[in-house]
Amino acid sequence: IRAEKAMVDGSWLDLAKRSKLEAQPFAHLTINATDIPTGSHKVSLSSWYHDRGWAKISNMTFSNGKLIVNQDGFYYLYANICFRHHETSGDLATEYLQLMVYVTKTSIKIPSSHTLMKGGSTKYWSGNSEFHFYSINVGGFFKLRSGEEISVEVSNPSLLDPDQDATYFGAFKVRDID
Amino acid sequence: IRAEKAMVDGSWLDLAKRSKLEAQPFAHLTINATDIPTGSHKVSLSSWYHDRGWAKISNMTFSNGKLIVNQDGFYYLYANICFRHHETSGDLATEYLQLMVYVTKTSIKIPSSHTLMKGGSTKYWSGNSEFHFYSINVGGFFKLRSGEEISVEVSNPSLLDPDQDATYFGAFKVRDID
Amino acid sequence: IRAEKAMVDGSWLDLAKRSKLEAQPFAHLTINATDIPTGSHKVSLSSWYHDRGWAKISNMTFSNGKLIVNQDGFYYLYANICFRHHETSGDLATEYLQLMVYVTKTSIKIPSSHTLMKGGSTKYWSGNSEFHFYSINVGGFFKLRSGEEISVEVSNPSLLDPDQDATYFGAFKVRDID
């Protein structure tokens, strides 16, 4: 009887593991405003919070400005990027802006970077208005392997809204790879 | 043998519960157009459908214009807000608009409100065009505790698109809190 | 003893099934740029990749330009649509554009189509700027039945960005219907 029970318990433990009682990975990273790059060119954003306010991470790693996958799976990835300018923040050098976000995946095995999602808009921010604002949201479902890295690039980083509710990105695992 | 089986069944029931065979909470709430506030100021939207058309709710509560969490967990929250204006609706008070959405969390234990997500755009809706439209989408992954309330605030509520496919917000539980 | 074990194993297998060890359906479809319709009218986009680059599908079917549900459930649906124009592509027929996306559900039992989500913006793409870009993102949580079909309609399809990171839609099952 004990042997039979052990066999059932083994199945049960195996099921427990396969049923994702193991914690599903996730991350929600918010912009670290103390270190936003300047300029109008496209840059990779490397400073994000992972453990304060709404920011959190579990079973993923944040290192060198990149979100590193620790567990193979299909993940839903998302990003929300807000740009803003007030006339007191300096005079805009151009009214024609390209406000963009690119969510990229880098594989360290094959050192190459690929854009998973992009979004944004060209905007005409005239000096006639004292305040300008624009937000981008992107999201999608992707297969990620352990060791792959997710990063976020934006144009015009000096216009980023530094609030934690404004500029963030994240991921959560939805299911295993068959 | 019966005792052994009872022990295994106990484990099985426990696993079933832990495996989230209990229904995972969700909500998809669509705007109730019969009660949209007027004006151009920022207001909390309190009238939403939860049981008609695409609107639905399970293991969450909708009360007093807020979506109430009944079960601790990590949830994916989202909102889609559409604004529109046709010249037949009369002239806009101003051509320079700030069209914004704020998804907020209120804790009744600590009576304070915090913005989880924001999005939107400043727009110039000139009289040269007879129709104007703009949509905002935000989404993110957040830890929510039982009793916490989610609400949606917008600027310029009188410009909201009242269609159920246009203006809605929702949530679904992804995983437990460890 | 064997009878007891069989009974427990039966429960275990049933649980395994109910615990979604069966693969959860998903799809991420990217635009097939070789067959984008022309014109500025609203059209259904029928050419999507399902098995190259970021595009993938599992336990759902892609047929005749529509994503077909094979398994009842609650799904998170999303779409990201990018529009762009460069002056080298020729002059725009009009500077006032309505750039829109509609994610629709069709039921073959009741041959009718309903819009689940819409988004977009009216835009003024003036000849003063050599490049224009705009992206829309929509997402929401919906109950889908086996046999129902999801499709995407857009205005101004000739302006679509053909990159796989730009124009895509998808779905993933989150939970069963009770």
């Epitope: 300047t38 300018h85 007191t88 300096g90 005079d91 805009l92 050098a93 151009t94 000096s158 | - | -």
Partner: antibody, heavy 122, light 108 residues
Framework: EVQLLESGGGLVQPGGSLRLSCAAS????????MSWVRQAPGKGLEWVSG????????YYADSVKGRFTISRDNSKNTLYLQMNSLRAEDTAVYYC???????????????WGQGTLVTVSS | EIVLTQSPGTLSLSPGERATLSCRAS???????LAWYQQKPGQAPRLLIY???SRATGIPDRFSGSGSGTDFTLTISRLEPEDFAVFYC?????????FGQGTKVEIK
């Protein structure tokens, strides 16, 4: 090589008007914001006005707002400063300067022209 | 507007000595958006430093900038005869762009 050459300065009575020009060469003029900066005799530097590359947006110091107008003719690679209702305190060397074009907001000035002297006196 | 105060007003040093010039802002300068210029008599100003610490093209490495927030410094590690001039700081993180009143570095 980037070159900026101001002209149009001179002696003018209080309440009078003057139009300064700045001829630019050595760069794609229409792609860069431009500014005017002045320096009263023996004093420090003061930003006066700025304009975007397209000419669509203009900015002014409070001290000249409503009296001075900045403009540009991109077909002629020329920047202008129309100065009306001139006062004694507007007496200064007026420099035209190029924005670097590397930041989305107008930032530092590089290079500068050699300057043109405006004297407002009766 | 942001007021920039430079100190000292005049700095008397000999060639080969180290010069340290200070620029203090009335409020924090966003994004280290600060530049330094050199102006010699009868000439237009010349850009030395932008972004608080980045050297402009063609500027010798004896010129260096540092600081953030409200306190910024221009350092000339070893003064050369041609370095004696008036130096101005300028912020561009807030509108309007403003200059300090200048520091004169003269030969002792």
């Amino acid at each position: 090589e980037v070159q900026l050459l101001e002209s149009g300065g001179g002696l003018v009575q209080p309440g009078g008007s003057l139009r300064l020009s700045c001829a630019a060469s050595g760069f794609t003029f229409s792609s860069y914001a431009m500014s005017w900066v002045r320096q009263a005799p023996g004093k420090g530097l003061e930003w006066v006005s700025g304009i975007t590359g397209s000419g669509g947006s203009t900015y002014y110091a409070d001290s000249v707002k409503g009296r001075f107008t900045i403009s540009r003719d991109n077909s002629k690679n020329t920047l202008y400063l129309q100065m009306n209702s001139l006062r004694a305190e507007d007496t200064a060397v007026y420099y035209c300067a190029k924005d670097p074009g590397t930041t989305v907001i107008m930032s530092w000035f590089d290079p500068w022209g050699q300057g043109t002297l405006v004297t407002v006196s009766s | 507007e942001i007021v920039l105060t430079q100190s000292p007003g005049t700095l008397s040093l000999s060639p080969g000595e180290r010069a340290t010039l200070s620029c203090r802002a009335s409020q924090s300068v966003r994004g280290r958006y600060l530049a330094w210029y050199q102006q010699k008599p009868g000439q237009a100003p010349r850009l030395l430093i932008y972004g608080a610490s980045s050297r402009a093209t063609g500027i010798p490495d004896r010129f260096s900038g540092s600081g953030s927030g409200t306190d910024f410094t221009l350092t000339i590690s070893r003064l050369e005869p041609e370095d004696f001039a008036v130096f101005y700081c300028q912020q561009y993180g807030s509108s309007p762009r403003t200059f300090g009143q200048g520091t004169k570095v003269e030969i002792k």
